[in-house]
């Protein structure tokens, strides 16, 4: 049967009317009526806008919109004691302070509210001491610092550059270097673009702007007080002590004229080679301290946030499925914002407004999806994703049994130059097949499809005439749902051409320059980029939704897992002495990735011969692609990190942005030569390849005819 | 029973080229990777290069740009095209499905 048929519905209704109903006015409008207030979680305005954004899919037309609420851990700076940086001179005095607030942009001045930037979840604390420039804090900045120059960061005070890597990565180097302070910084090099002007005047950040942000290390957790179980009336609380995922020195952002001030007396080492300067007039000097004239001055944080338990809310819409009810596609994104959110999140929202009220559209004339469509607006997604995941946890029962897949939607863009795909390999084709169907935003692709201009401007580094789709990391909604629990995960957004600076982000990113005027006028002022990203999420979705056969390749999977084997191999061979000595082996996960190969190449024959007019037969195959994602998760997690599940991919432990492939068996070889007990440590090794080995195989055997 | 038999090997100018051969038996060739090592005398193992099951290659720094290894699955054999050779590319070179099953091992040594 068609998909008309299986939904008893008129074949207009079909992908075609729901792209059409798709409009770019609508979504222009939906983000000017989103970014004209602060909305930061926790805060009356967000609810507000929950209750607004419940409202209006109602009107659209869902079949029920609900509010969820948790009580969660959030973060705040003091009203009455703001946080700030002093250089101190020898008698303690302050001799120059960083700045308290972001210079409002244009019309914005009288805006009540908008929080001053700061780093969430920092303790208080009032350290002083020397400073020592880390670069960007990454795991390979802090090897060069104590193992080559052999600079000692204990008892400092460090400033690092944002950017490379998430924020909460380059905290947790800081701590474990013993530093007993952390001062984050945007520099030009990162976040202004040449040939470009400063906000208003263009999409560069000004030297007053500065990046917010939460350090926290949450590995997955949700709210740090309630990990692994929803922050509901009933939830027992951790003590602060033992919360998930807290810093334990003071941490505080600043922008670059106030790094200026800090850098330009730096004294001590030089750095070591030209990756570690800047843009700034300064000479990058490592410390520690300041150069001899200033030597005795000092540098010393006051930081007085607070972390309180708060009401958030999720919006829940449902739009229930004619065939299947029980299977779930899921469309989500958050709402909250730390400022305006012109950007993030709320380019993501108004495209999800959009779909919502297209979807809607074709309810009304009668039509509904076979598979029942959930849309969420998520809270607190800045604080650490809490919405989602205490919304997953208290659904995790659900969500495992019944989720087919998840569709992220953030900011819409990060620049407007090509499509950009993070996804599991079972989307993959999906992903290709629908591009093929939509035509190109961009100029010089007048006629061609977003398949070709991507292709053009993005290839994959390994198929000629494919565009490069990227593994999932983290730092966004999908975590819980992919990473945890295994659903099928994907997200697309429109990007910059600046692969070198992948995840530093765009220069005015939770700055309060994010604004409206920012997207209208310098990003997509025909919003053509945010209705090509609404067709793509939509589109995904609708097919999920829709299909009669899920629109999952099993063979994707496959070429992946051999080539994330011979990568991790590769890695592993680089120790061959030690490979010989303590006899490890590769042979189990070649064996089950030749078998995963085999037996998905069946399934997929299979698949095209099967009678799809069988409703349990097709029941049965579409439950074996639904689960297969599923059996990738070890309920044990990855060792230090239970939330992490997922075997073939996790966050990096270096960069919660980016994902690692076989992260088990990763992290076990990372730095193993410096470990002390190497027979110990290979051992681990060992020990992970056989849990990925068994992993694979046992996915391949939920492929595996049934009886 | 699995085995690695290397071959190729010999005496070479500095700036001249050798290409190594290791056919293999025992297991699915195809369906896995492998690696070159070498030992030069009175050294450690070092890795040299491997190839994926799926065709992917990585060197090591020290022979990036000079060496390639390529695979005929059809002929179960694996290779390595050493050019550029230099007077530290003297070693042992050995073929290596992992830690446990490895070749003998074939000379190269490089002097003029």
């Known amino acids: 049967k068609s998909s008309n048929e299986a939904t008893n519905i008129t074949p207009k209704h079909n992908m075609k009317a729901f792209l059409d109903e798709l409009k770019a006015e609508n979504i222009k409008k939906f983000l000017y009526n989103f970014t004209q207030i602060p909305h930061l979680a926790g805060t009356e305005q967000n609810f507000q806008l929950a209750k607004q954004i419940q409202s209006q899919w109602k009107e659209f037309g869902l079949d029920s919109v609900e509010l969820a609420h948790y009580d969660v851990l959030l973060s705040y700076p003091n009203k009455t004691h703001p946080n700030y940086i002093s250089i101190i001179n020898e008698d303690g005095n302050e001799i120059f302070n960083t700045s308290l607030f972001e210079p409002p942009p244009p019309g914005y001045e009288n805006v009540s509210d908008i929080v001053p930037p700061f780093s969430a979840f920092s303790p208080q604390g009032m350290p002083e001491g020397d400073l020592v420039y880390v670069n960007y804090a990454r795991t390979e900045d802090f090897f060069k610092l104590e193992r080559d120059m052999k600079i000692n960061c204990s008892g400092k005070i460090v400033i690092a550059r944002y950017g490379k890597v998430f924020r909460g990565n380059k905290v947790k180097n800081a701590q474990l270097a013993g530093a007993k302070g952390v001062i984050l910084y945007s520099d030009p090099a990162d976040y202004f673009a040449p040939g470009v002007k400063s906000y208003p005047d263009g999409w560069n950040l000004p030297g007053g702007g500065v990046q917010r942000g939460n350090i926290l290390n949450l590995n997955g957790a949700g709210d740090p007080l309630t990990p692994g179980y929803p922050a509901n009336e009933y939830a027992y609380r951790r003590g602060i002590a033992e919360a998930v995922g807290l810093p334990s020195i003071p941490v505080h952002p600043i922008g670059y004229y106030d790094a200026q001030k800090l850098l330009e007396k730096m004294g001590g080492s030089a750095p070591p080679d030209s990756s570690w300067r800047g843009s700034l007039k300064v000479p990058y000097n490592v410390g520690p301290g300041f150069t001899g004239n200033f030597s005795t001055q000092k540098v010393k944080m006051h930081i007085h946030s607070t972390n309180e338990v708060t009401r958030i809310y999720n919006v829940i819409g449902t739009l229930r499925g004619a065939v299947e009810p029980d299977r779930y596609v899921i469309l989500g994104g958050h709402r909250d914002s730390w400022v305006f959110g012109g950007i993030d999140p709320q380019s993501g929202a108004a495209v999800v407004h959009e779909i919502v009220r297209s979807f809607g559209t074709l309810k009304k004339e009668g039509w509904r999806p076979r598979r029942t469509i959930l849309f969420a607006s998520w809270d607190a997604e800045e604080f650490g994703l809490l919405g989602s995941t205490e919304w997953a946890e208290e659904n995790s029962r659900l969500l495992q049994e019944r989720g087919v897949a998840y569709i992220n939607a953030d900011s819409s863009i990060e620049g407007n130059y090509t499509l950009r795909v993070d996804c599991t390999p079972l989307m993959y084709s999906l992903v290709h097949n629908l591009t093929k169907e939509l035509k190109s935003p961009d100029e010089g692709f007048e006629g061609k499809s977003l398949y070709e201009s991507w292709t053009k401007k993005s290839p994959s580094p390994e198929f000629s005439g494919m565009p490069r789709i990227s593994k999932l990391g983290s730092g966004n909604d999908f975590e819980v749902f992919f990473q945890r629990l295994g659903i099928a995960s994907g997200r697309a957004r429109y990007t910059k051409n600046w692969e070198t600076n992948k995840f530093s982000g765009y220069p005015l990113y939770h700055s309060v320059y994010e604004t409206y005027e920012l997207v209208e006028k310098f990003y997509d002022p025909m919003f053509k980029y945010h209705l090509t990203v609404a067709q793509v999420r939509g589109g995904m979705v609708f097919e999920l939704a829709n299909s009669i056969v899920l629109p999952f390749d099993c063979r994707d999977y496959a070429v992946v897992l051999r080539k994330y084997a011979d990568k991790i191999y590769s890695i592993s061979m680089k120790h061959p002495q030690e490979m010989k000595t303590y006899s490890v082996s590769f042979d189990s996960l070649f064996s089950a990735v030749k078998n995963f190969t085999e037996i998905a190449s069946k399934f997929s024959e299979r698949l095209q011969d099967f009678d799809k007019s069988n409703p349990i037969v097709l029941r049965m195959m579409n439950d074996q692609l639904m689960f297969l994602e599923r059996a990738f998760i070890d309920p044990l997690g990855l060792p230090d990190r239970p939330f992490y599940r997922h075997v073939i991919y996790a966050p990096s432990s270096h960069n919660k942005y980016a994902g690692e492939s076989f992260p088990g068996i990763y992290d076990a070889l990372f730095d193993i030569e410096s470990k002390v007990d190497p027979s110990k440590a290979w051992g681990e090794v060992k020990r992970q390849i056989y849990v990925a080995a068994f992993t694979v195989q046992a996915a391949a055997e939920t492929l595996s005819e049934v009886a | 029973e699995v085995q690695l038999v290397e071959s190729g090997g010999g005496l070479v100018q500095p700036g001249g080229s050798l290409r190594l051969s290791c056919t293999v038996s025992g297991f699915t060739f195809s369906s896995y990777a492998v690696s070159w090592v070498r030992q030069a005398p009175g050294q450690g193992l070092e890795w040299v290069s491997a190839i994926g099951a799926g065709g992917g290659t990585y060197y090591a720094d020290s022979v990036k740009g000079r060496f390639t290894i390529s695979r005929d699955n059809s002929k179960n054999t694996l290779y390595l095209q050493m050019n550029s050779l230099r007077a530290e590319d003297t070693a042992v070179y050995y073929c290596?499905?992992?830690?446990?099953?490895w070749g003998q091992g074939t000379l190269v040594t490089v002097s003029s």
């Open positions: 290596a499905k992992d830690g446990v099953d």
